[in-house]
Interface confidence: medium
């Protein structure tokens, strides 16, 4: 239904507090070197003027789109130039354009100092004088490092780090409540990050089709008893709801999620037993919630997949009535049989069931050719199993941070011209999916492992089309989302690399390393690691192991000693020189 | 490259019948559900129904229903449209239309069929 | 039974301007809708499928977007060749039937 004020509209429908978070989270992701304050202050302009609109629908510029309301609002931020340079073209554009220019800008990997937590006593007098502002400058601080993070989502995010703060500052011993419990929720929204960042993606480069395809699968496998009708339904509204927030329309995305969610709380009869739990709680917390809900029981009657899909003899006719509803009823009745595949394993076989068919249905007898189409999923579905297997193995065998550093050696030597802090950064998360997944039940794994992976797999595409280097990763990034994985894994050495010359200030240390943080420690040592791949590409897991073991015995060692600095520079050069002869 | 062409226009009197014909080339005509689809003067287009070329099982929208009968003939790759008992309100031009993945495309040329007394 | 209706019935506009024409259906459709040109004693082209989807050989110009019950076609800026009427259609989920939109004539101005 239309409305006279679009800005009104979503005020009313959100509540001022969402209202201003979600503006904030928007200002945030498209200008992300703006401060807090100045982006504070457009928050409060805007929500003044939205205001003024419920009161009076008719009044001066309500009835304008929000993206010019948005639009006009940063375009007239002072020395917007000076700040963001070419940014400031899309001002000269009108709506849409504008606004894709504005998405087009948006920056994955902007060069912001990281995120530092300050000391727990700090965070909790600050906190106790002015939560709104504290919170704000978590929104801030997060919009504009993830500018794609799904906007709902992320003030679910500040309402867990609110109650947090509030539990842990009455506590005696801050420090050691909020470390753990805040820890979890940076986890948690990392991995979140990426995972919006892929829908998007999909939904960038391959269309709403491609984002509704997934949303199929992934539906199917959660609400098994839920008919098709019900889950199409789902993975329309789910689809323009990412394609919202996706585009920047956060007011209307975080909106629409609430509907479907009041949708999904109202029909659970029709989709799934397992929705009560969430429905009980708050709408952030039951978004959340319904989006990460256990999978219903499997229908104990399900026939085989075959009798449709196969052995009917109306396969071509059914498929070339209507090619997408035929191939979504196999995706949904594939999918709902395998909560224990990947959303990605599961449209690669309906890829391939596609492939089949259209190969097959031109030819003169059809049943016998895609006869056989179901045996021929099997070598698709053994690959991302033998990998799990494979890596949750040598993730069981050499923990979180020696399974980063084998993970470092194989991307590095498939991508030595990826520069190196991209390696590492890769190698770090793709490692962590060892202690996400590896620890799951048997038939949770694949699932966590590969769509995990393709993920992060995402972001490593997404920074490498900045300054592209690498002929293997082009050509893996390049391809369909779902292949890109497999793609990846296939890589081997890139035997085209001329290896870097060794050069020993690479491999110099100086006692400051003693003092950081074990996670900064542990990225010291595997951007060492990564250019002792690119200098010798070929170097055997034996020689490398060599060197590195090596390296932590002389950090160990100097480190521990009376005198750091004096240890360091001379027992420094004799470990380089050892690298060079372990490796030669 | 795929075509469809369509027979001639067509003059008749109330009461006759009347076949027209939609000849494909340039694919294979048993891989495509076929459709008819009316257009009469000054107005817009009205789907008719359509047909699967390999058993010739066809589908009628309810409005055309016993009005017209589609057929095909494998053997000339050729699709038809016949009516046993035209009347003057079945004057309209007629295309047929290779369904493709849920839209219609290439269309035939059309074929007018005027029926007047 | 569905009904597309299609809005504005005539638009009148320049070239180089940008039309914007709407199809909205009764009933939520998912993205199974197709939008077509006809120019005067020619056959229907084909511009978008699936809601969204330009057809082989159509200029960049023409976009389709929406989904559920509101669906719009984009000429982005009108060019001499594009006065025609364009008509949206529809499919039905399962088992599959077609209906057309009464169709949007633009004129040149």
């Known amino acids: 239904e239309a409305h006279k004020s679009e800005i009104a509209h979503r005020y009313n429908d959100l509540g001022e507090q969402h209202f201003k978070g979600l503006v904030l989270i928007a200002f945030s992701q498209y200008l992300q070197k703006c401060s807090y304050d100045e982006h504070a202050k457009l928050v409060q302009e805007v929500t003044d003027f939205a205001k003024t609109c419920v009161a009076d629908e008719s009044a001066a510029n309500c009835d304008k789109s929000l993206h010019t309301l948005f639009g006009d609002k940063l375009c007239a931020i002072p020395n917007l130039r000076e700040n963001y340079g070419e940014l400031a073209d899309c001002c000269t554009k009108q709506e849409p354009e504008r606004n894709e220019c504005f998405l087009q800008h948006k920056d994955d990997n902007p060069s912001l100092p990281p995120f530092e937590r300050p000391e727990a006593e700090a965070m909790c007098t600050s906190f106790k004088e002015n939560p709104t502002t504290f919170m704000g400058h978590y929104l801030h601080e997060v919009a504009r490092r993830h500018p794609y993070f799904y906007a709902p989502e992320l003030l679910y995010y500040a309402e867990q780090y609110n109650e947090i703060l509030t539990q842990c500052c009455a506590e005696a011993d801050k420090e050691s409540c909020l470390t753990p419990k805040l820890d979890g929720v940076k986890e948690k929204a990392l991995v979140s990050s990426v995972r919006q960042r892929m829908k998007c993606s999909s939904m960038q480069k391959f269309g709403e089709r491609a984002f509704k395809a997934w949303a199929v699968a992934r539906l199917s496998q959660t609400f098994p008893n839920a008919d098709f009708a019900e889950i199409t339904k789902l993975a329309t509204d789910l689809t323009k709801v990412n394609k919202e927030c996706c585009h920047g329309d956060l007011l209307e995305c975080a909106d629409d999620r609430a509907e479907l969610a009041k949708y999904m709380c109202e029909n659970q009869a029709t989709i799934s037993s397992k929705l009560q739990t969430c429905c009980d709680k708050p709408l952030l917390k039951k978004a959340h919630c319904l989006s990460e809900v256990e999978h219903d029981t499997m229908p104990a009657d399900l026939p085989a997949i075959a009798a449709d899909f196969v052995e009917d003899q109306e396969v071509c006719k059914n498929y070339a009535e209507a090619k997408d509803v035929f191939l979504g009823t196999f995706l949904y009745e594939y999918s709902r049989r395998h909560p224990d595949y990947s959303v990605s394993l599961l449209l690669r076989l309906a890829k391939k069931y596609e492939a089949t068919l259209e190969k097959c249905c031109a030819e003169a007898n059809p049943p016998a050719c895609y006869g056989t189409v179901l045996a021929e999923f099997q070598p698709l579905v053994e690959e991302p199993k033998n990998l799990v297997k494979t890596n949750c193995d040598l993730y069981e065998k050499l923990g979180e941070y020696g399974f980063q550093n084998a993970i470092l050696v194989r991307y590095t030597q498939k991508a030595p011209q990826v520069s190196t802090p991209t390696l590492v950064e890769a190698a770090r998360n793709l490692g962590r999916v060892g202690t996400k997944c590896c620890t799951l039940p048997e038939d949770q794994r694949l699932p966590c492992v590969e769509d995990y992976l393709s993920a992060i797999l995402n972001r490593v595409c997404l920074l490498h089309e900045k300054t592209p280097v690498s002929e293997h990763v082009t050509k893996c990034c390049s391809g369909s989302l779902v292949e890109r994985r497999p793609c990846f894994s296939a890589l081997t050495v890139d035997e085209t690399y001329v290896p870097k010359e060794f050069k020993a200030e690479t491999f110099t240390f100086h006692s400051d390393i003693c003092t950081l943080p074990e996670k900064e420690k542990q990225i010291k040592k595997q951007t060492a690691l990564a250019e002792l791949v690119k200098h010798k590409p070929k170097a055997t897991a034996e020689q490398l192991k060599t060197v590195m073991d090596d390296f932590a015995q002389f950090l160990d060692t100097c480190c521990k000693a009376a005198d750091k600095d004096t240890c360091f520079s001379t027992e420094g050069p004799n470990l380089v020189t050892r690298c060079k002869d372990a490796l030669a | 490259e795929v075509q469809l062409v369509q027979s001639g226009t067509e003059v008749k009197k109330p009461g006759e019948s009347l076949k027209i014909s939609c000849k494909i080339s340039g694919y294979s005509f048993t891989a495509y559900w076929i459709a008819w689809v009316r257009q009469m003067p000054g107005k817009g287009l009205e789907w008719m129904g359509m047909i699967w070329p390999p058993d010739a099982d066809a589908r009628y929208s309810p409005s055309f229903q016993g009005q017209v009968t589609f057929s095909v003939d494998k053997s000339i790759s050729t699709a038809y449209l016949q009516w046993h008992s035209l009347k003057t309100s079945d004057t309209a031009v007629y295309y047929c239309?290779?369904?493709?993945?849920?839209?219609?495309?290439?269309w035939g040329q059309g074929t007018l069929v005027t029926v007047s007394s | 039974e569905l009904v597309l209706t299609q809005s504005p019935g005539t638009l009148s506009l320049s070239p180089g301007e940008r039309a914007t024409l709407s199809c909205r259906a009764s009933?939520?459709?998912?993205?199974?809708v197709a939008w077509y040109q006809q120019k005067p004693g020619q056959a229907p082209r084909l511009l978008i499928y699936?809601?969204?989807n330009r057809a082989t050989g159509i200029p960049a110009r023409f976009s389709g977007s929406g989904s559920g019950t509101d669906f719009t076609l984009t000429i982005s800026s009108l060019e001499p060749e594009d006065f025609a009427v364009y008509y949206c259609q529809q499919r039905s989920k399962w088992p599959p039937t077609w209906t057309f939109g009464q169709g949007t004539r633009v004129d040149i101005k």
């Open positions: 009933q939520s459709i998912f993205n199974y």
């Open positions: 699936d809601a969204s």
């Open positions: 239309a290779r369904l493709y993945s849920g839209s219609y495309s290439p």
